[in-house]
């Protein structure tokens, strides 16, 4: 279930997945929520003088049992991911941090009159993930009223330091406030030849697009279908970027589908979940649990309710079916995507809906019933 | 549906076939079950045939060939065409059908969820259009229900493709840039559904397009979320207790 409580002066021991820098516990929790395996986090708001490099450290953790031993640590804040918290799941983060320098790669320095203008500049720049603004009282005159646009490989600061008269914050693209506009075109039989930032395995171009949207550095993508000639690249979704922020003209390529991240959409962005169930498709991955249920929808619901489950397979093979139902395999992987996708199985596969804003319910919000 | 595939029984249980019985009986439009006594469809389906008596509505079927004289059908008790719909314009292409007798819900015949007014800005990424319509522009009605997945196209983009028409906020467009997949003649009134948060929602009603599945000519659908007030008003005023709201 959904657990929103934060534990002050508490640190979870073990279960480490990744460590990043975040300006506060709320942002750390957000990062944990969107990480494919993170269930728990610990954030260091205050550290002893000897460990200043650990201050603002956000430690993302996993646990087979869903919990980890707690140790007392002054200045630490710990909590749970919001993976099953429906309406509380949002990538949008509007907070502004006074007196903090969120460091990263400075790729643009512009003069702006205020912090709002600076944040807007960041929101309207393809590459900007976070920014730092130097006020008119900053000790170095050449940086006063300057807006530094930044990015990093992880999308989060490479370090965070306290500094007077500096204000930092994040791009509001994920709040649907970017004015860049978002092309929703899907280019059939076309590939983009730009720089790959990552690759994942997906069943279709729409899942690929959603993954691109929520990846910190993906601006557009190319997906190769299962008919693609190179076997190792079948069902591979290449997440891409370019210096200009725009792709080079698409190259005609049979069995390739390309498109754009929807990060800069003005209207509500897609949810970070994939609800479609794929018939005759096998999502391979690490086995988490096996249950017997009646129907792929119920299997998906079971996966959604099992917090560590990322995707599932529902088998309809006679040997996999009993009186109480057929085999529902709950699975996971390091990146949340199947490790391999194969076709022709008797059954279906799909993803957990744990990051959907609304948990699945067959009931409509609005029902029309003449009684 | 152009560029689609055969659907399976019970896959789209809200889909109905609207047929006209004159000398013979023919499929003219699709529709969607939204309540035990309610079907939502396109107003233009009734142009020239606004007579409730000649219409027969079939739900829970996959193949039109399943329909015989013995196949149970629903009759129209009340036909509510949007009061602003004009034959000379393409706006307000929406109509409600109140059935004479309530439907029994089964695995193969049940309602589709309606969006809320708040869903007007939601971006849907898993959308499907279904129907028994033509599979090419100069085609014929299909026997087996067809389905096709199709991406939504922003209205500004759609307006650029249809310079001679007004694409307003009560419309929603869907299609691939290079064409190839689309609704077609006979699919009118049928559903454009999208799965969102694990739930299928009726996002559009098949309305019109320039030809079928042409390059740079998306399909245009009536945007259901923009008509929620109208739908609720009509279904409520027809029956004081017609509406039931459940929390999501």
């Amino acid at each position: 279930g959904c657990m929103t409580q934060l534990y002050k002066n508490t640190f979870f021991r073990g279960g480490d997945l990744a460590a990043i820098y975040t300006p506060d516990a709320q942002y750390c929790q957000k990062m944990c929520t969107f990480h494919p395996r993170c269930l728990l986090f610990s954030f260091l708001a205050v550290t002893p003088p000897k460990e200043t490099n650990k201050r603002f450290g956000c430690f993302m953790k996993e646990s087979i049992t869903g919990t980890l031993p707690r140790i007392h640590r002054t200045g630490a804040i710990s909590g749970h991911s919001l993976k099953q918290c429906g309406h509380q799941i949002s990538a949008c983060h509007r907070d502004i941090y006074k007196g903090l320098d969120m460091r990263g790669s400075n790729f643009n320095i512009s003069k702006t009159d205020n912090i709002e203008e600076c944040q807007k500049l960041c929101t309207n720049n393809f590459h900007c993930q976070f920014f730092t603004y130097a006020t008119s009282a900053f000790y170095r005159p050449e940086y006063r009223k300057k807006c530094l646009l930044k990015h990093s490989a992880s999308g989060t600061p490479t370090s965070i330091k306290s500094a007077d008269n500096l204000v930092s914050g994040f791009s509001l693209k994920s709040c649907a406030l970017s004015e860049i506009g978002c092309p929703m075109d899907i280019f059939q039989h076309s590939a983009f030849a730009d720089l790959n930032v990552s690759q994942v395995i997906t069943p279709d171009a729409f899942v690929c697009r959603t993954i691109c949207t929520f990846h910190p550095n993906c601006l557009f993508f190319t997906f190769y279908t299962n008919e693609w000639e190179t076997e190792s690249q079948r069902n591979v979704c290449f997440l891409k970027t370019s210096k200009s922020g725009r792709p080079s003209p698409p190259i005609p390529q049979e069995n390739a589908i390309s498109g754009y991240s929807l990060l800069t959409c003005r209207k509500t962005r897609p949810e970070p979940c994939h609800s479609k169930i794929y018939s005759g498709v096998d999502f391979e991955g690490e086995e988490l649990n096996v249950t017997f249920v009646q129907g792929a929808d119920v299997c998906q619901e079971t996966c959604t309710k099992t917090i560590r489950c990322q995707f599932f397979i529902y088998s309809l093979l006679p040997q996999d079916c009993k009186e109480e139902g057929c085999k529902c395999s709950l699975r996971l992987s390091t990146d949340g995507s199947p490790t391999r996708i194969t076709y022709g199985m008797q059954g279906s596969s799909g993803y957990s809906l744990r990051l959907c804003k609304l948990v699945d319910s067959p009931d409509c919000t609005t029902k029309i019933n003449a009684r | 549906i152009v560029g689609g595939t055969n659907a399976s029984l019970g896959e789209w249980p809200w889909q109905v076939s609207l047929q006209v019985k004159l000398v013979s009986q023919t499929h003219l439009c699709g529709g969607s079950i939204i309540g035990r006594q309610w079907v939502l469809t396109a107003a233009h389906c009734f142009d020239g045939i606004p007579y409730p008596d000649v219409w027969r509505i079939y739900g829970g079927i996959l193949s039109l060939s399943e329909i015989t004289k013995e196949t149970p059908s629903s009759r129209i008790k009340e036909l509510i065409i949007h009061q602003e719909y004009k034959v000379s314009e393409g706006n307000y292409d929406i109509a409600l059908i109140k059935l004479q007798t309530p439907l029994n819900y089964t695995e193969f015949q049940k309602p589709i969820c309606l969006p809320s007014k708040a869903d007007t800005n939601t971006i849907y990424t898993n959308c499907w259009v279904t129907g028994w319509g033509y599979t090419k522009e100069q085609g014929e009605t299909q026997n087996i229900l067809q389905k096709a997945t199709i991406p939504l196209v922003p209205n500004e983009e759609c307006q650029k493709k249809y310079r001679d028409y007004v694409i307003n906020k009560q419309m929603i467009c869907a299609g691939y840039k290079e064409g190839g997949t689309d609704a077609c003649k006979g699919d009118s009134g049928g559903p454009l559904v999208c799965k969102h948060s694990g739930r299928w929602q009726l996002v559009g009603i098949t309305s019109w397009g320039e030809g079928c599945a042409r390059k740079d000519q998306p399909g245009v659908y009536t945007k259901v979320s923009e008509y929620m007030d109208w739908i609720l008003e009509k279904t409520q005023s027809s029956d004081v207790r017609a509406l039931e709201t459940s929390s999501a």
């Epitope: - | 396109a42 233009h44 142009d47 004009k86 034959v87 000379s88 314009e89 393409g90 706006n91 292409d93 319509g133 310079r163 001679d164 028409y165 007004v166 609704a183 077609c184 003649k185 006979g186 699919d187 009118s188 098949t206 309305s207 019109w208 397009g209 320039e210 030809g211 079928c212």
Partner: antibody, heavy 125, light 108 residues
Framework: EVQLLESGGGLVQPGGSLRLSCAAS????????MTWVRQAPGKGLEWVSY????????IYADSVKGRFTISRDNSKNTLYLQMNSLRAEDTAVYYC??????????????????WGQGTLVTVSS | EIVLTQSPGTLSLSPGERATLSCRTS???????LAWYQQKPGQAPRLLIY???SRATGIPDRFSGSGSGTDFTLTISRLEPEDFAVYYC?????????FGQGTKVEIK
């Protein structure tokens, strides 16, 4: 009641200019494509030009391309036809018409459902 | 451009008779974009049929349209005195939009 009223016709010399107006009432002008059709004395109907509801898209018959300009002012519910470099063969009654574009069988329909009474343009020296 | 050829050029009939007017197009025309108009001397044309077969508002049911592809027909089942006029078919399937040359229905 839908009404279209043309004005601006008259006698003009070859090479001259004329601007026709069509005042529309009784319908939401900005929803409709509008068109001009002409009819030379004793001859059949000839389509001249049309303009999209917003005014952003215009199409012309080859016989008038480059010489005639169709425009509209949706705030004034008025359609215009600016005619330059007029020739004797442009002599005709000019009608403005509303283009109805309904929906039938999942396609749009297109037809001229209301016409003005016409205005005569005579090009002669 | 799509050329519309109407036949016959003139049709001489008596009131009460049936009139059949033909319109042939040089290329395929989607029937949604085929219309018929009636014009009397000194008057503006009047819409009779749109979408090849749908009667316009206020048009008596003795007028009917049919056809598809490249062959279209306007039928007046029983001619009334007020029906003697010139009839035009017109396509707006492709630009330039074009009219047929007209068929004159005159009293025999």
């Amino acid at each position: 009641e839908v009404q279209l009223l043309e004005s601006g016709g008259g006698l003009v010399q070859p090479g001259g200019s004329l601007r026709l107006s069509c005042a529309a009432s009784g319908f939401t002008f900005s929803h409709y494509l509008m068109t001009w059709v002409r009819q030379a004395p004793g001859k059949g109907l000839e389509w001249v030009s049309y303009i999209s509801p917003s005014g952003g898209h215009t199409i012309y018959a080859d016989s008038v391309k480059g010489r005639f300009t169709i425009s509209r002012d949706n705030s004034k519910n008025t359609l215009y036809l600016q005619m330059n470099s007029l020739r004797a063969e442009d002599t005709a009654v000019y009608y403005c018409a509303r283009v109805a574009r309904g929906i039938a069988a999942r396609s749009r329909t297109s037809y001229f459902d209301y016409w003005g009474q016409g205005t005569l343009v005579t090009v002669s020296s | 451009e799509i050329v519309l050829t109407q036949s016959p050029g003139t049709l001489s009939l008596s009131p009460g008779e049936r009139a059949t007017l033909s319109c042939r197009t040089s290329q395929f025309v989607n029937s949604n974009y085929l219309a018929w108009y009636q014009q009397k001397p000194g008057q503006a044309p009047r819409l009779l049929i749109y979408g090849a077969s749908s009667r316009a508002t206020g048009i008596p049911d003795r007028f009917s349209g049919s056809g598809s592809g490249t062959d279209f027909t306007l039928t007046i089942s029983r001619l009334e005195p007020e029906d003697f006029a010139v009839y035009y078919c017109q396509q707006s399937s492709r630009t330039p939009w074009t009219f047929g040359q007209g068929t004159k229905v005159e009293i025999k």
